[in-house]
Interface confidence: medium
């Protein structure tokens, strides 16, 4: 039975040209995390594998940085980065857990950070 839950940074906003940290945290399960995938709609941004470490998709290498922890940092944001982001936790023996984050990249100089909290 899958008992775990994923906490995420929820709906967040950031300024164009700035950076943002996407974070998810899997709790309430003793399952082993074997891999975490970060995806934007249907595009793979990065993978953190328990044995092979991090892999950043070549097309995002200049704008995506791993961490902190299993999170992902998006840099040099553009309005086109607005959209849904998913953290997909592959675990054993539970299976797959998915968390959703909605990022809005604003043109304005004041981006309100709604539902933003720090997960280690």
């Amino acid at each position: 039975m899958m008992t775990g839950t994923i906490e995420t940074t929820g709906n967040i906003s950031a300024e164009k040209g700035g950076s943002i940290i996407l974070q998810c945290h899997l709790s309430s399960t003793t399952a082993q995390v074997t891999q975490v995938n970060w995806e934007q709609q249907d595009q793979l941004l990065a993978i953190c594998n328990a044995d092979l470490g991090w892999h950043i998709s070549p097309s995002f290498k200049d704008r995506v940085a791993p961490g902190p922890g299993l999170g992902l940092t998006l840099q040099s944001l553009t309005v086109n980065d607005t959209g849904e982001y998913f953290c997909i936790y592959h675990t054993y023996p539970d299976g797959t857990y998915t968390g959703r984050i909605f990022l809005e990249v604003l043109e304005s100089s004041v981006a309100e950070h709604g539902a933003r909290f720090q997960i280690p």
Partner: antibody, heavy 118, light 107 residues
Framework: QVQLQQSGAELVKPGASVKLSCKTS????????IQWIKQRPGQGLGWIGE????????YYNEKFKGKATLTIDTSSSTAYMQLSSLTSEDSAVYSC???????????WGQGTSVTVSS | DVQMTQTTSSLSASLGDRVTISCRAS??????LNWYQQRPDGTVKLLIY???KLHSGVPSRFSGSGSGTDYSLTIRNLEKEDIATYFC?????????FGGGTKLEIK
């Protein structure tokens, strides 16, 4: 097998700088974080910071900002830490270590002893 | 910063004994607790990560447990090669802080 080979012991004068190296082998250098840890006798271990060779991203412990600078050379799979404006408080053994996600260090270098003395 | 406290700085035990080393965090660290072994020659090895998961190649006589702020490392059937200093480390919140270490000696 995974190995992190650090440079030899250093004796440096107060006010000087020193650059320590950590040559890695046995794994894909650009896929793991390299962390640096300080150990002084009787004072335990202190986390200095980490660098991700795949992107050059760094995170520092606030206590070491301005003191330590972390860099990498991907062509030789080597990580470096430069320590500046050295004082006797910087005399310690400095270790590099490999980490998948920052939360766990799975392999350590053998450490480099730095002695600051006039 | 999260403070990590190992109240016992040194411990003496006999070969074959069961030994428990404790570590306390100043706040809840959500099981992100690692144990490292530092041999007298300075070599450091990861033993346990995420409270209770055994690192590859580590003998099964080592085990870890705990939650919240209190954690422990247990060594069953103590062997000569286990003579070392043991450090706990929290990986929950940067900067990742270490305990002061517990030096294990043979009686």
């Amino acid at each position: 097998q995974v190995q992190l080979q650090q440079s030899g012991a250093e004796l440096v004068k107060p006010g000087a700088s020193v650059k320590l190296s950590c040559k890695t082998s046995g794994y894909t250098f650009t896929s793991y974080w390299i962390q640096w840890i300080k150990q002084r006798p009787g004072q335990g271990l202190g986390w200095i910071g980490e660098i991700f060779p795949g992107t050059g991203t760094t995170y520092y412990n606030e206590k070491f900002k301005g003191k330590a600078t972390l860099t990498i050379d991907t062509s030789s799979s080597t990580a470096y830490m430069q320590l500046s404006s050295l004082t006797s408080e910087d005399s310690a053994v400095y270790s590099c270590a490999r980490s998948r996600d920052g939360k766990v260090v799975d392999y350590w270098g053998q450490g480099t002893s730095v002695t600051v003395s006039s | 910063d999260v403070q990590m406290t190992q109240t016992t700085s040194s411990l003496s035990a006999s070969l074959g004994d069961r030994v428990t080393i404790s570590c306390r965090a100043s706040q809840d660290i959500s099981n992100f607790l690692n144990w490292y072994q530092q041999r007298p020659d300075g070599t450091v090895k990861l033993l346990i990560y995420y409270t209770s998961k055994l690192h590859s190649g580590v003998p099964s006589r080592f085990s870890g447990s705990g939650s919240g702020t209190d954690y422990s490392l247990t060594i069953r059937n103590l062997e000569k090669e286990d003579i070392a200093t043991y450090f706990c480390q929290q990986g929950n919140t940067p900067p990742y802080t270490f305990g002061g270490g517990t030096k294990l000696e043979i009686k």
